[in-house]
């Protein structure tokens, strides 16, 4: 997402299930720490937004051209999974360690 | 890149190496297709834009609390290389066939 | 191989309360629900409620719901069923089981109670 | 009252074959796996049969189990005197969102 003065970064983002209507087949926990990366991707791109050629491109013409092309956006680059207890297809509560790609483990400009 | 009403596709951007001071290493092309994503990430994700499961959730809080968290961003998911002619550190001029990361393949939601 | 212990067997006055205790040896605790089923004498099985160890989660039979709470220690792999406002009705051999809720396990396993407790006799009793 | 039927006893002499019914509902066996425990006297419930048909490994192979519908039943061949032992069903209910058990069937090997 992009954000208005700050940098790139991986910021708090606390879901609760109930919010977004996953408590229904998704039994513990009740809330989960899934992070948001948030902030701009400013000229110069730096090392810890581990840019893409395309990213680094992209913020050139962003700077010659701001009207016409966008900055690039400052996305999950790397996600990390979460445990959840979940109703089974036969509603049965099951155990699934490794939940993948629920949370942020980092960001960068892409 | 967010797009206002359209949903996150890929559109065209060409490259002029000069606009963005590279021609003084790169030789040939002039300019190239790098593409650029843009439009928004809009309820519901679509498969097309193969949605992380972060993404999803991003998606679903953002519209319980439009306010609070933004929406998953129209970003490259794949990237191409291109064929670039180039000065090496002696300033002889060389070929390399796949210069990674500088074009868009894929765009998606994350 | 997987055991579970069971706490000895107790006597109790109507209107009190009873904790068994389970231990679980071998396998990974957190791998299993621990569920708890009763057996009046001659009677058959019936099913009280579980708990997952990891999350802590527990859930009931609506007959013994606000009556009965299920818990567990995953430092010590012991699981607990507390009965309170005991009854003569209550008077029976309760068992744990096991049931592994790790979906890295066929489905078709996974719901099966295996193995069980040696069981404890609880007789409510004036 | 059991919320899974079972008779509550069969008998049969050594060599024979017996089945054990077991009628539910398509919220518990018409919908999910079924699953059968034997009991000897004075033991704990132990395993028999999970998924439908399957037998946990040291089950001979003369105990097997089927489902059609809403019905599961237990058959024991060629009976031995060590059969003899109570027999339980047992099923996930999904509308109850609760573990439901037959009542049990007596079984007793005659001679």
């Known amino acids: 997402s992009t954000g208005a003065g700050s940098h790139c970064q991986k910021t708090s983002l606390r879901v609760n299930f109930e919010d977004i209507g996953w408590n229904s087949w998704i039994i513990a926990p009740k809330e989960y720490e899934a992070y948001e990366c948030k902030g701009g991707c400013f000229f110069p791109l730096a090392d810890d937004v581990t840019p893409t050629k395309h990213a680094i491109v992209q913020t050139l013409v962003h700077l010659k051209f701001p009207t016409k092309v966008g900055k690039a956006c400052c996305v999950p680059t790397k996600l990390s999974p979460i445990s959840i207890l979940y109703k089974d297809d036969m509603g049965v509560p099951t155990l699934k360690y490794h939940y993948e790609g629920m949370s942020v483990a980092e960001c960068g400009c892409r | 890149s967010t797009g206002a009403g359209s949903h996150c596709q890929k559109t065209s951007l060409r490259v002029n190496f000069e606009d963005i001071g590279w021609n003084s290493w790169i030789i040939a092309p002039k300019e190239y297709e790098a593409y650029e994503c843009k439009g928004g990430c809009f309820f519901p994700l679509a498969d097309d834009v193969t949605p992380t499961k972060h993404a999803i959730v991003q998606t679903l809080v953002h519209l319980k609390f439009p306010t609070k968290v933004g929406k998953a961003c129209c970003v490259p998911t794949k990237l191409s290389p291109i064929s670039i002619l180039y000065k090496d550190d002696m300033g002889v001029p060389t070929l390399k066939y796949h210069y990674e990361g500088m074009s868009v393949a894929e765009c998606g939601c994350r | 191989q997987v055991q579970l212990v069971q706490s000895g067997a107790e006597v109790k006055k109507p209107g009190s309360s009873v904790k068994v205790s389970c231990k679980a040896s071998?396998?990974?605790?957190?791998?299993?629900?621990i569920h708890w089923v009763r057996q009046a004498p001659g009677q058959g099985l019936e099913w009280m409620g579980g708990?997952?160890?990891?999350?802590?989660?527990?859930y009931y039979a609506q007959k013994f719901q606000g009556r009965v709470t299920i818990t567990a220690d995953e430092s010590t792999s012991t699981a607990y069923m507390e009965l309170s406002s005991l009854r003569s009705e209550d008077t029976a051999v309760y068992y744990c089981?096991?049931?592994?809720?790790?979906?890295?396990?066929?489905?078709?396993?996974?719901?099966?109670?295996?193995?069980w407790g040696q069981g404890t006799l609880v007789t409510v009793s004036s | 009252q059991s919320v899974l039927t079972q008779p509550p006893s069969v008998s049969g002499a050594p060599g024979q074959r017996v089945t054990i019914s077991c009628s539910g509902s398509?919220?518990?066996?018409?919908?999910?796996?079924v699953y059968w425990y034997q009991q000897l006297p004075g033991t704990a419930p132990k395993l028999l049969i999970y998924?439908?048909?399957n037998r946990p490994s040291g089950v001979p192979d003369r105990f097997s189990g089927s489902k059609s519908g809403t019905s599961a039943s237990l058959a024991i061949t060629g009976l031995q005197a060590e059969d003899e032992a109570d027999y339980y069903c047992?099923?996930?209910?999904?509308?109850?969102?609760?573990?439901?058990f037959g009542g049990g069937t007596k079984l007793t090997v005659l001679g």
């Open positions: 047992n099923a996930w209910d999904t509308k109850a969102y609760v573990w439901v």
């Open positions: 998924g439908n048909n």
């Open positions: 398509s919220s518990n066996i018409g919908s999910n796996y």
């Open positions: 089981a096991r049931r592994i809720v790790s979906d890295s396990v066929a489905v078709q396993y996974r719901h099966a109670f295996d193995p």
């Open positions: 071998g396998g990974t605790f957190s791998d299993y629900a």
């Open positions: 708990i997952i160890p990891f999350f802590g989660t527990a």
